[in-house]
Interface confidence: low
């Protein structure tokens, strides 16, 4: 893993004045033990609105690696395997919580951060805008 | 909001032996200020694999409210507006991090938890699984 130098300005984790601060145990409890590990591994390829997955890495964030979906086409794949531009591939986005090291490089202090990620793509009927 | 009684067994947030613990500032920084608030508000209805959104609430979790997508149909909507069962609506799932109060009802101590949520649905070509 990456060794992050300790910032001398990191707050003392026992500082009672640390704003709206809570203690968080990083031993992650995974509630997904019974889920099929292949649950959606190939949907990105089999979808009528297929997508590619791009790795987004940031050592100052926890989790440091997030996978971002990018739709492959503007249109959707039809029954013949061709791109149909009468439909649109659009990203399904979700706001997720991550932990951001704050101040930077501090090993034991974080701020909650909300980021928007594209999880996959779906095929939608386009909205027709009528020009006045 | 719900007032959660303090559990007398809550760990002291200054306890140096608290396992793999970090300080987290809950003043959320939102990186999504420039995003279009309507970004996917109607995709659930316009998709060829439409979905409904179900509210999942848990006061012991942060965030306490998570919206779960449930695909409306087994098949996908075709050009005529009918359900085509030769294609499948499937949920796009993502593992997200949440904070779980631990021990329960403690206002200032949490454990990171990974949960699987369905964000929306996409239309895929069916796959044949051979049974051993």
């Amino acid at each position: 893993g990456i060794t992050i130098p300790r910032n001398p300005g990191c707050p003392n984790s026992e500082d009672k004045n640390f704003p709206r601060t809570v203690m968080v145990n990083l031993n992650i409890h995974n509630r997904n033990t019974n889920t099929n590990p292949k649950r959606s591994s190939d949907y990105y390829n089999r979808s009528t609105s297929p997508w590619n997955l791009h790795r987004n890495e940031d050592p100052e964030r926890y989790p440091s690696v997030i996978w971002e979906a990018k739709c492959r086409h503007l249109g959707c794949i039809n029954a013949d395997g061709n791109v149909d531009y009468h439909m649109n591939s659009v990203p399904i986005q979700q706001e997720i919580l991550v932990l951001r090291r704050e101040p930077p490089h501090c090993p034991n202090s974080f701020r909650l951060e909300k980021i928007l990620v594209s999880v996959g793509c779906t095929c939608v009927t386009p909205i027709v805008h009528h020009v006045a | 909001g719900i007032t959660i009684p303090r559990n007398p067994g809550c760990p002291n947030s200054e306890d140096k032996n608290f396992p793999r613990t970090v300080m987290v500032n809950l003043n959320i920084h939102n990186r999504n200020t420039n995003t279009n608030p309507k970004r996917s508000s109607d995709y659930y209805n316009r998709s060829t694999s439409p979905w409904n959104l179900h509210r999942n609430e848990d006061p012991e979790r942060y965030p306490s409210v998570i919206w779960e997508a449930k695909c409306r149909h087994l098949g996908c909507i075709n050009a005529d507006g009918n359900v085509d069962y030769h294609m499948n609506s499937v949920p796009i799932q993502q593992e997200i991090l949440v904070l779980r109060r631990e021990p329960p009802h403690c206002p200032n101590s949490f454990r990171l938890e990974k949960i699987l949520v369905s964000v929306g649905c996409t239309c895929v070509t069916p796959i044949v699984h051979h049974v051993a």
Partner: antibody, heavy 124, light 107 residues
Framework: EVQLVESGGGLVQPGGSLRLSCAAS????????MAWVRQAPGKGLEWVAT???????YYRDSVKGRFTISRDNAKNSLYLQMNSLRAEDTAVYYC??????????????????WGQGTLVTVSS | AIQLTQSPSSLSASVGDRVTITCRAD??????MHWYQQKPGKAPKLLIY???NSEIGVPDRFSGSGSGTDFRLTISSLQPEDFATYYC?????????FGQGTKVEIK
Amino acid sequence: EVQLVESGGGLVQPGGSLRLSCAASGFPFSDYSMAWVRQAPGKGLEWVATIGPSGDTYYRDSVKGRFTISRDNAKNSLYLQMNSLRAEDTAVYYCASPPQYYEGSIPRLWPAHWGQGTLVTVSS
Amino acid sequence: AIQLTQSPSSLSASVGDRVTITCRADESVRTLMHWYQQKPGKAPKLLIYLVSNSEIGVPDRFSGSGSGTDFRLTISSLQPEDFATYYCLQTHSYPYTFGQGTKVEIK
């Protein structure tokens, strides 16, 4: 265990009507598509109609406009309303449901469970 | 409608014989082909789904193969309880269609 029990068959004159029922149990009825399949005496199997979980309906051409497939999810029941009956509609009518397993993303639409059948005779 | 043609319409075989029944579609049904067994006075029983998958509880002497338009049901070693009529079914497109059936009789 999946159970399908048909009822409502009988003797009817040409041009008459009958309503077949199928009581389903042992599976989450509202989640599955259901079908009616018939078999004329001494003949092969013939698909009649399917209703999807969301109520969408599909019919063979020879019964379109005469037969109506419907469902009551609260009662776990499937129905086939048959109007303007003809001699060629004489058959044993089976109610059928798809498999209950789910492997990946397979459109589960082939009949896996069948009722015992109910005989419809159209004759003057 | 997609037409399915089974061959032969009937066959006579002995216990222990290997039997193959074919089902030909007049257009592609991809992998949406299934096989049923029916005995007189009884409801059909699903044997094979999606070309080659054995339904739970079906003896492994029954197997399916093929793709697109040509499909086969094979009984590797015919048993006394296998004498029945066999049907193929396509669920690729409405209206769903069955083959006309193949009657397997004792020689």
